[in-house]
């Protein structure tokens, strides 16, 4: 039987006594960063070329003793793993390995910097297919290193990092906090965050997915033939290279926006016990494990959106905090949450010649994040419609008034320190679904986009009984781009989007009386793009 | 069940060529290395090198290398062993075994395949 | 290479006795990551390819009689037949499957007296 990580990122369909995806990565380069290698192990031979690239530091201690099994025993398997011929995931891979890791596993920045230098002046000596850049390591945060990724990535190539090992919030640690950077948390075979004994896989809003990193079977630098079990993000990592790779050997123009908005998608969802996370960062951390697509084409019709937050704001009574998307990105929507529940809202507006969510803080509160929808949307021409302000008692209102846009998500912020809180809630009028509706003292942002074949529609789910959270979906075949609640409900902490699910989080209800304050009411937008369908079919 | 098939026994000259096959049934063909071993008349066992048939991967007992060549068609589940010319010393039973990334070990062999080569 | 050295040559037990083969590696043929010794015992009878008795040193493999077992770990190993049978005359090989060249041990011959 195959080894139970190969099995879990393999679709049901490709499922046999073996492990044979349809493409295993042959166009696709991988380099690996890290400890030297035992490249004649039959596991690897053939596959995996030692660059003369190597910048360690020393090793620590007068009596270390450097035995070559131990040094290079990261590395091999890693390199297994990634492109091994029995148990690695892109069997069809060719890697290229850089020692910036010492017989201890220790690096330097510098080091790194320099190896990430030396890929990219391969890169333009002699540019091949698609790159595929494999960090498993993990340092304090650098600010310098994260540039460095950066640059990497803008030229082409996609970069997929280790979250680190140190049950911790992975934005604290480099290169995993790189926005760029592909960031990979551990799970286990019961699809369990992984522990490390008395310390685990990182998590947080800098991960991007989970993937296989505990009893990982790999080559072992013991012999020729050895294996070895390993566990770890940097094993996880691995895996996600991988996958990467066979998806971008499938499809060699993908973007890095749109391999990873692929990767996302094509994960297991809500399949992680978030229980093991401490409680404010369970919200962040995406419960995501990775898996091959089930088939390697066909996916181009899907609008793929992903949710990014923002880092905390902090508690000062004008701290705002910042959404970004990636470059190739649309903003779609943009919404908030806190804690506490106070909050001024958020908005879209431009900045550096593109649109970012802001939200703000109020006074008083803990802090807020923002949260940015980030879809994929070629030849979108999108802005933001804002109303101040209204005077009428109906609230404020604004839609899409131009030909052919459509509402793809609604945002509101506000001045006033205590919004709504002894006002009965704003209903929307029926039959008015591209418009955005709130609070008459709340501007109101409407995101509006002109994409072709895009449709969209508004979903809805109310409770009238105060609930801690209240959710509504999309439907197959729609993408939800937009999440927010209905206005009126002072109690409503906040909404975001998990995955295709808008979730409005409101105060624990023993705290909320059961009148009409308690209502909440979820409200979703759903589009889809025929555009992409048709353009799928012809391909075909 | 899981057998190792080989071609039948050859009787050659010097300096002729010379490919002799390995057939596997009953396992997933290209899961498994195919290596290839020696036993000259009252001799023992001498490994010669291996084949991987789902990427052609081969590694050679350096006293073999450039002797022979190995090769595999996975389409047909075949491993061969070949000799572009022929010497005395080749005479030899040659057999094919098969072993695994988990089983590192020779657990199934082929029949063997008696090479002579004489003038 | 890793040489494998076989003692005795050749070995006349009687029927129902013990026979005992000795095996020496070079180097060891244990490994820290998984424990393991990667040794195994064949066994060739006249005109026969040869079969797997014993692998990680001493896991019999499935069928075989439980009066061969194997012992050893690093670089000395035995293979020992707790009771002879007439069956068992052959050729014993010991194998170490860890590294490149794989090597086998010059045989040990075993026969009733």
């Known amino acids: 039987s195959i080894p139970w990580n190969l099995e879990r990122i393999t679709p049901p369909r490709y499922r046999a006594d073996e492990y044979q995806p349809p493409d295993g990565g042959s166009l696709v380069e991988v380099y690996l960063l890290d400890t030297s290698i035992q490249s004649d192990h039959r596991e690897i031979e053939g596959r995996v070329m030692v660059t003369d690239f190597e910048n360690v530091p020393e090793e620590d201690g007068t009596r270390f003793h450097r035995q070559a099994s131990k040094c290079d025993s990261h590395g091999t398997h890693l390199a297994g793993v990634v492109s091994g011929r029995d148990a690695g995931v892109a069997k069809g891979a060719s890697m290229r390995s850089l020692r910036v890791l010492n017989c201890q596993g220790k690096g330097t920045v510098s080091g790194t910097l320099i190896g990430l230098e030396f890929i990219r002046k391969s890169q333009l000596v002699q540019p091949v297919g698609p790159l595929v850049v494999l960090l498993p390591l993990a340092g304090g945060y650098s600010r310098v290193l994260n540039a460095a990724c950066q640059r990497l990535a803008r030229a082409g190539v996609v970069l997929v990092t280790a979250a680190g090992n140190f049950r911790d919030d992975a934005c604290l640690y480099s290169p995993a906090s790189a926005p760029e950077v592909i960031t990979v948390g551990a799970t286990n075979a019961q699809d369990q965050p992984v522990t490390l004994g008395t310390l685990g896989t990182n998590f947080g809003r800098c991960v991007d997915l989970f993937a296989p990193g505990e009893d990982i079977i790999g080559a072992s630098s013991d012999c020729s033939t050895c294996f070895v079990s390993q566990s770890g993000t940097s094993q996880a990592a691995a895996h996600v290279a991988g996958i990467a790779a066979m998806m971008l050997s499938a499809e060699p123009e993908l973007t890095l926006a749109e391999l990873r908005q692929r990767l996302i998608h094509f994960s297991a969802k809500d399949v992680i016990n978030e229980a093991w996370f401490p409680e404010d960062q369970r919200v962040l951390t995406p419960n995501l494990v990775a898996a091959l697509p089930p088939s390697t084409h066909g996916a181009g019709w899907q609008l793929f959106c992903r949710t990014v937050w923002s880092a905390h704001s902090g508690p000062t009574r004008m701290a705002t905090a910042v959404a970004r998307c990636a470059p190739d990105e649309e903003l779609l929507s943009c919404s908030s949450f806190s804690r506490s529940g106070k909050r001024r809202g958020e908005r879209m507006e431009a900045q550096g010649g593109k649109l970012v969510c802001r939200a703000h803080n109020a006074f008083g509160g803990e802090g807020v994040y923002a949260i940015a929808r980030c879809c994929l949307l070629p030849q979108a021409n999108c802005s933001v419609h804002t109303a101040p302000p209204a005077e009428a008692s109906m609230g404020t209102r604004v839609h899409c008034h131009q030909q052919g846009h459509v509402l793809t998500g609604c945002s509101s912020h506000w001045e006033v320190e205590d919004l709504g809180t002894h006002k009965p809630p704003v209903l929307r009028p029926r039959g008015q679904p591209n418009q955005c509706v709130g609070h008459r003292e709340a501007s109101i942002h409407a995101s509006c986009c002109h994409a072709p074949g895009l449709e969209c529609k508004v979903k809805e789910h109310g409770i009238p009984a105060p609930q801690e959270q209240v959710t509504v979906a999309c439907e197959e075949g729609w993408t939800l781009t937009g999440c927010s609640a209905l206005p009126g409900t002072s109690h409503v902490l906040g909404a975001y989007a998990v995955d295709n699910t808008c979730v409005v989080r409101s105060r624990d209800v023993s705290t909320t009386g059961s009148t009409s304050e308690g209502a909440v009411t979820a409200v979703a937008i759903c589009c889809r793009s025929r555009h992409l369908a048709q353009a799928s079919q012809e391909l075909q | 069940q899981v057998q190792l098939v080989q071609s039948g026994a050859e009787v050659k000259k010097p300096g002729e060529s010379l490919k002799i096959s390995c057939k596997g049934s009953?396992?997933?063909?290209?899961?498994?290395?195919i290596s290839w071993v020696r036993q000259m008349p009252g001799k023992g066992l001498e490994w010669m090198g291996l084949?991987?048939?789902?990427?052609?991967?081969?590694h050679y007992n350096p006293n073999f290398q450039g002797q022979v060549t190995i090769s595999a068609d996975k389409s047909i589940s075949t491993a061969y062993l070949q000799w572009s010319s022929l010497k005395a010393s080749d005479t030899a039973m040659y057999y094919c075994?098969?072993?695994?990334?988990?089983?590192?070990?020779?657990?199934?062999w082929g029949q063997g395949t008696l090479v002579t080569v004489s003038s | 290479d890793i040489v494998m050295t076989q003692s005795p040559d050749s070995l006349a037990v009687s029927l129902g006795e013990r026979a005992t083969i000795n095996c020496r590696s070079s180097?060891?043929?244990?490994?820290?990551?998984?424990?393991?010794?990667?040794l195994a015992w064949y066994q060739q009878k006249p005109g026969q390819p040869p079969k797997l008795l014993i692998y990680?040193?001493?896991t019999r493999e499935s069928g075989v009689p439980d009066r061969f077992s194997g012992s050893g770990s690093g670089t000395d190993f035995t293979l020992t037949i707790s009771s002879l049978q007439a069956e068992d005359v052959a050729v014993y090989y010991c194998?170490?499957?860890?590294?490149?060249?794989?090597?086998f041990g010059q045989g040990t011959k075993v026969e009733i007296k």
């Open positions: 075994a098969r072993d695994h990334w988990s089983k590192p070990y020779f657990d199934v």
């Open positions: 990680w040193a001493s």
């Open positions: 009953g396992y997933s063909f290209t899961d498994y290395y």
């Open positions: 084949i991987y048939p789902g990427d052609s991967y081969t």
């Open positions: 194998q170490q499957y860890s590294s490149f060249p794989i090597t």
């Open positions: 180097q060891s043929v244990l490994y820290s990551s998984n424990n393991k010794n990667y």
